[in-house]
Interface confidence: medium
């Protein structure tokens, strides 16, 4: 029950995370104009991974796509790639995890297969989350670098004259959405991996103890109770659960040194 809950919760958390990664990737507010020095501005600029927008004092907004591919900064291209890889891995992970869910029965799928699928989707979610966090962090680092560079330029004008014309950009809402979404996908992936351990069939087998009390003879097999630790090998090629156990008909009482009258 706990395994099903952990798996289900992991799936839901990852689903929310991937939806967030998609939303962040599509959002225009990756970087927004810093209004610290000029809160009452006629124009508000903000930029996304795919287009740049301007909002005027009237409230009217216009966006323009980056129609060039070669002219864009390498860092922006890298961020785009990381986010897309994150989305693709996450989407595949979701698809795999749907079939891996314990509450969903598909034909006669073994628990071991479900466990493997759960682990696969979990790893995919973890990588997806890491891609999103990496992408957002790279963009944030780029912003911080540019922000301080433009701040330095602002106050080192000609003859120490302050230049306030330079537009500085700060963190946009998409960055926070991306960080949270990446984190959720990562957590969901970890939960799926934990659930996988619970889904995997137990390797601990117990060989049955054979007791026989018919008439005067009691057949007792010492050492018949053996927990398989994985170190001993099944040398006699018997069925693993056979364990030397016998039915009433099979067991014959031959005199031996272990027989007590």
């Amino acid at each position: 029950m706990a395994v099903t809950a952990c798996q289900g919760l992991g799936f839901v958390v990852s689903l929310i995370g991937i939806a967030g990664i998609i939303a962040a990737t599509c959002m225009d507010q990756w970087s927004t104009q810093d209004l610290y020095n000029n809160p009452v501005t006629a124009v508000f600029n903000y930029q996304g991974l795919w287009r740049s927008c301007v909002r005027e004092s009237s409230g009217f907004t216009e966006c323009r796509g980056y129609f060039t591919l070669l002219g864009l900064p390498a860092m922006l291209q890298a961020v785009r790639a990381l986010m897309i890889v994150g989305i693709v891995l996450g989407a595949i992970g979701l698809l795999v995890s749907i079939f891996a869910l314990k509450c969903i029965r598909i034909g006669s799928m073994e628990d071991s297969a479900k466990a493997n699928m759960t682990l696969t989707s979990g790893i995919m979610f973890i990588v997806s989350g890491l891609c999103a966090i990496a992408g957002v962090s790279v963009f944030a680092n780029m912003l911080v670098t540019n922000f301080w560079m433009s701040t330095a330029n602002m106050y080192t004008g000609m003859g120490g004259m302050v230049q306030t014309v330079q537009t500085r950009y700060t963190f946009g809402a998409a960055l926070f959405v991306g960080w949270v979404a990446g984190g959720l996908t990562l957590i969901g992936g970890v939960m799926m991996c934990i659930a996988c351990r619970g889904l995997a069939p137990e390797e601990t087998n117990y060989k049955a103890v054979s007791y026989h009390a018919s008439g005067h003879s009691v057949a007792y097999k010492p050492g018949g109770f053996k927990a398989s630790t994985g170190f001993g090998s099944n040398t006699k090629n018997k069925k693993i659960y056979d364990g030397g156990a016998r039915t009433e008909d099979e067991v014959q009482s031959y005199p031996s040194k272990h027989d007590y009258v």
């Epitope: 006629a42 124009v43 600029n45 301007v54 909002r55 005027e56 004092s57 009237s58 409230g59 009217f60 216009e62 323009r64």
Partner: nanobody, 127 residues
Framework: EVQLAESGGGSVQAGGSLRLSCAAS????????MSWFRQAPGKEREGVAA????????YYVDSVKGRFTIFQGNAGATVYLQMNSLKPEDTAMYYC????????????????????WGQGTQVTVSS
Amino acid sequence: EVQLAESGGGSVQAGGSLRLSCAASRYISSSYCMSWFRQAPGKEREGVAAISTRGGSTYYVDSVKGRFTIFQGNAGATVYLQMNSLKPEDTAMYYCAAAEGLCGWGGWESAVRFGSWGQGTQVTVSS
């Protein structure tokens, strides 16, 4: 490309008013930045005021703020520049210019951004 024609220029005493109009050859449906520039003899062309045809956001150079008003006509094909409290330093040739996109993209005060220009109308302010 949009064809532009200015009118309304003339001579006026300092402190007087004038209204310049800029008529576009067609109704501007998409977003355009309509700007008024002026060029005094021996000086560079400078942006005076601008308006975004969509949204109606307005922009002014510091020297005319509070004195000049830019606005659109109801038809959407005419832009006006209402000039009050005129000064002798406002004497110049006034040009109307149009560029695609909101003025907020920047460069409304720079002639480089604008592809469509009118012939200009002369404004003379005497003291």
